[in-house]
Interface confidence: low
């Protein structure tokens, strides 16, 4: 599923991601844009054989498991393919463990260079939330 | 249960390209991956690639580049792989299977015979 | 490439012989190190997952064993059934990689 940006705040605020560990909604969207472009089935391979799945591109190393991932450590304690739902439970329940991981959204390399220090309240801008 | 279900035989003439079926039923088709294995006589089972049908992704092993291209169609639960430039190294039994790491699901096979 | 080296090429035995089946891999490959059946004119058939996990459905006599560089596949006690071809796999990396195979076949 592509989500469109007004759609995707409001999913994302419905499973209580707003203001989570003090990161605003805008924050989470501008993630989700260019992590995946809003694609729930976005995946990408990594250098070190690992992939990224979702809306927010969880990495296989550490936190779900595809069965593909050696020395996988699985903290979100899911199959990686739960994470190409439609329905993003499963992604905001695992981004929900990472960001309080102690690196906050710094875990997520996109957010960290497209989206940290910008006006990312324009994400959620016009939308009935 | 989970089943792969491939094309069947083909006899082809080189120079010619063939595309090659593996319908899948009995699991949630978007979200593993299908591997695709190339098996000749004396030469064991080589990987061909990978395609994720949920989202088009696909990995080639660097051998089959612009010999092999996957696709899949999610409204029949159908991968594809075509096979271009046919010549008679291309002869053999072509497999998909389930991707989980191991391949604990394959289909039965597909026979290409390429011959003037 | 990873590459993995069966050995031997070709075992026979006595049904009722125990055997070993041996893979070698070209670099350390943690336990990512999958056993196959394969009969003639049939798909291959998952034995062991992860170098010591049986796959659902096989025989107890089916066991493996090994962690890096070297594996082995055991049957205990060999029946007429399993005759045939035994090839491995590698999940480490990519390209997936596939041994040789060892023929097992009836003295």
């Known amino acids: 599923k592509v989500f469109g940006r007004c759609e995707l705040a409001a999913a994302m605020k419905r499973h209580g991601l707003d203001n989570y560990r003090g990161y605003s909604l805008g924050n989470w969207v501008c993630a989700a844009k260019f992590e995946s472009n809003f694609n729930t089935q976005a995946t990408n391979r990594n250098t070190d054989g690992s992939t990224d799945y979702g809306i927010l591109q969880i990495n296989s190393r550490w936190w779900c498991n595809d069965g593909r991932t050696p020395g996988s450590r699985n903290l979100c304690n899911i199959p990686c393919s739960a994470l190409l739902s439609s329905d993003i439970t499963a992604s905001v329940n695992c981004a929900k463990k990472i960001v309080s991981d102690g690196n906050g959204m710094n875990a997520w390399v996109a957010w960290r260079n497209r989206c940290k220090g910008t006006d990312v309240q324009a994400w959620i801008r016009g939308c009935r939330l | 249960q989970v089943q792969l279900q491939e094309s069947g035989a083909e006899v082809m003439k080189p120079g010619a390209s063939v595309k090659i079926s593996c319908k899948a039923t009995?699991?949630?088709?978007?979200?593993?991956?299908i591997e695709w294995v190339k098996q000749r006589p004396g030469h064991g089972l080589e990987w061909i690639g990978e395609?994720?049908?949920?989202?088009?992704?696909?990995y080639y092993n660097e051998k089959f580049k612009g010999k092999a291209t996957f696709t899949a169609d999610t409204s029949s639960n159908t991968a594809y792989m075509q096979l271009s430039s046919l010549t008679s190294e291309d002869s053999a039994v072509y497999y998909c299977?389930?991707?989980?790491?191991?391949?604990?699901?394959w289909g039965q096979g597909t026979t290409l015979t390429v011959s003037s | 490439d990873i590459e993995l080296t069966q050995s031997p090429a070709t075992l026979s035995v006595t049904p009722g012989d125990s055997v070993s089946l041996s893979c070698r891999a070209s670099q350390s490959i943690s336990n990512n190190l999958h056993w196959y059946q394969q009969k003639p004119h049939e798909s291959p058939r998952l034995l062991i997952k992860?170098?010591?996990q049986s796959a659902s459905g096989i025989p107890s006599r089916f066991s493996g064993s090994g962690s890096g560089t070297d594996f082995t596949l055991s049957i205990n006690s060999v029946e007429t059934e399993d005759f045939g071809m035994y090839f491995c796999?590698?999940?480490?990396?990519?390209?997936?990689?596939f041994g040789g195979g060892t023929k097992l076949e009836i003295k």
């Open positions: 395609i994720l049908p949920g989202s088009g992704s696909t």
């Open positions: 992860y170098a010591s």
């Open positions: 796999q590698q999940s480490n990396s990519w390209p997936r990689t």
């Open positions: 009995g699991y949630t088709f978007t979200t593993y991956w």
């Open positions: 299977a389930r991707g989980d790491g191991f391949y604990c699901y």
